[in-house]
Interface confidence: medium
Amino acid sequence: SGTTNTVAAYNLTWKSTNFKTILEWEPKPINQVYTVQISTKSGDWKSKCFYTADTECDLTDEIVKDVKQTYLARVFSYPAGHVESTGSTEEPPYENSPEFTPYLETNLGQPTIQSFEQVGTKVNVTVQDEWTLVRRNDTFLSLRDVFGKDLIYTLYYWKSSSSGKKTAKTNTNEFLIDVDKGENYCFSVQAVIPSRRTANRKSTDSPVECMGHEKGESRETGHHHHHH
């Protein structure tokens, strides 16, 4: 049944990247508001986004407490303007979300190439370690801190003058690759969790960075750093 003139939420969807996690739902409210609750399988319900007219709720603060837990959320619908004074003991209509385990399901954000440095025929490419909102001992953890050896990076690199791509992989944030002397190369990286079997095992590719695109550079003899 449910409270008069309110519609239960539907299409509850988790949107999560690098553990920044938002629950979205429909419909856009007409004369109603929503409250969200979240819990672990064995925990108590905690209310968030009280009486909101939005159709999304940021649950990051809750899920980062333990990213390996499995969470369930539910969205309650209330009549607008009568939230506290309906006098009804009837439970408002609500809808449950799918279960969500952040460690398994959060999408990997687009990585960034922090720097590349050439010495002779070797280039060291460094991937920027993304910070997350996951904490340990009051310190924010990086993506590498959270995923450890489960996370690798794939480097795609090619001569500026050709389209043939080569790849390298690392389970740190650094690559050391061989290049041809006198050639400029372009680089792009992708974050990968190989042991995920789902569509979210790979990030989108980083922006492409190319050698020789800054004025006054000499790659042959010295070091080069490109920072964002």
Epitope: K41, S42, D66, K68, D150, I152, K169, S195, R196
Partner: antibody, heavy 118, light 107 residues
Framework: EVQLVQSGAEVKKPGASVKVSCKAS????????MNWVRQAPGQGLEWMGE????????TYNQKFKARVTMTVDQSTSTVYMELSSLRSEDTAVYYC???????????WGQGTTVTVSS | SIVMTQSPDSLAVSLGERATINCKAS??????IAWYQQKPGQSPKLLIY???NRYTGVPDRFSGSGYGTDFTLTISSLQAEDVAVYYC?????????FGGGTKVEIK
């Protein structure tokens, strides 16, 4: 179908070495760490170490660090575990096990019995 | 390294009855616990990971719970095919360590 097929039973003398193989099929071999776990007769499970098939890098249980070597052959999707300076207490069934995302061992080989006896 | 202590060592339960196995970690392992089933002469099989998530294909009579140091595997209605030794394992901190096992039999 994921399969981990191990080499056959071995009988070794004390002080010798044994090399056990584990051939993987049915999945992306370089995408998952391979672990080795042993089980002495009538006893529980004991983790020995793991190897990253993509890089060949390995991590060993301190207890076995001086005696164990794990290697990989990407061309045949096979990992190897060699244990040296064998003693009678190394008599056990040795399993390879694929580590799933986050830590658990989702697939196990059928086990290789190693008997150390003079 | 983290020590995992299982109790009881063995358990006899009537068919259709509930079986409960406990596992205690010597320090907090968050929910980094897996449970395995090993039948005689077979390799272990993964049942539960992240303390409470059933692995693919595992019947829903198996459930896991707990957080921190104390964990439980429950078989809600014991079937004949559930006779086995059950092990907990922490995958929170290397070296990964296992409990000593609990043998489940039919009463």
């Amino acid at each position: 179908e994921v399969q981990l097929v191990q080499s056959g039973a071995e009988v070794k003398k004390p002080g010798a070495s044994v090399k056990v193989s584990c051939k993987a099929s049915g999945y992306s071999f370089t995408g998952y760490y391979m672990n080795w776990v042993r089980q002495a007769p009538g006893q529980g499970l004991e983790w020995m170490g793991e190897i990253n098939p993509s890089t060949g890098g390995s991590t060993y249980n301190q207890k076995f660090k001086a005696r164990v070597t794990m290697t990989v052959d990407q061309s045949t999707s096979t990992v190897y575990m060699e244990l040296s300076s064998l003693r009678s207490e190394d008599t056990a069934v040795y399993y390879c096990a694929r580590r799933e995302l986050g830590g658990p061992f989702g697939y196990w080989g059928q086990g290789t019995t190693v008997t150390v006896s003079s | 390294s983290i020590v995992m202590t299982q109790s009881p060592d063995s358990l006899a339960v009537s068919l259709g009855e509930r079986a409960t196995i406990n596992c205690k970690a010597s320090q907090s392992v968050s929910n980094g616990i897996a449970w395995y089933q090993q039948k005689p002469g077979q390799s272990p099989k993964l049942l539960i990971y992240f303390a409470s998530n059933r692995y693919t294909g595992v019947p829903d009579r198996f459930s896991g719970s707990g957080y921190g140091t104390d964990f439980t595997l429950t078989i809600s209605s014991l079937q004949a095919e559930d006779v086995a030794v059950y092990y907990c394992q922490q995958d929170y901190s290397s070296p990964w360590t296992f409990g000593g096992g609990t043998k489940v039999e039919i009463k």
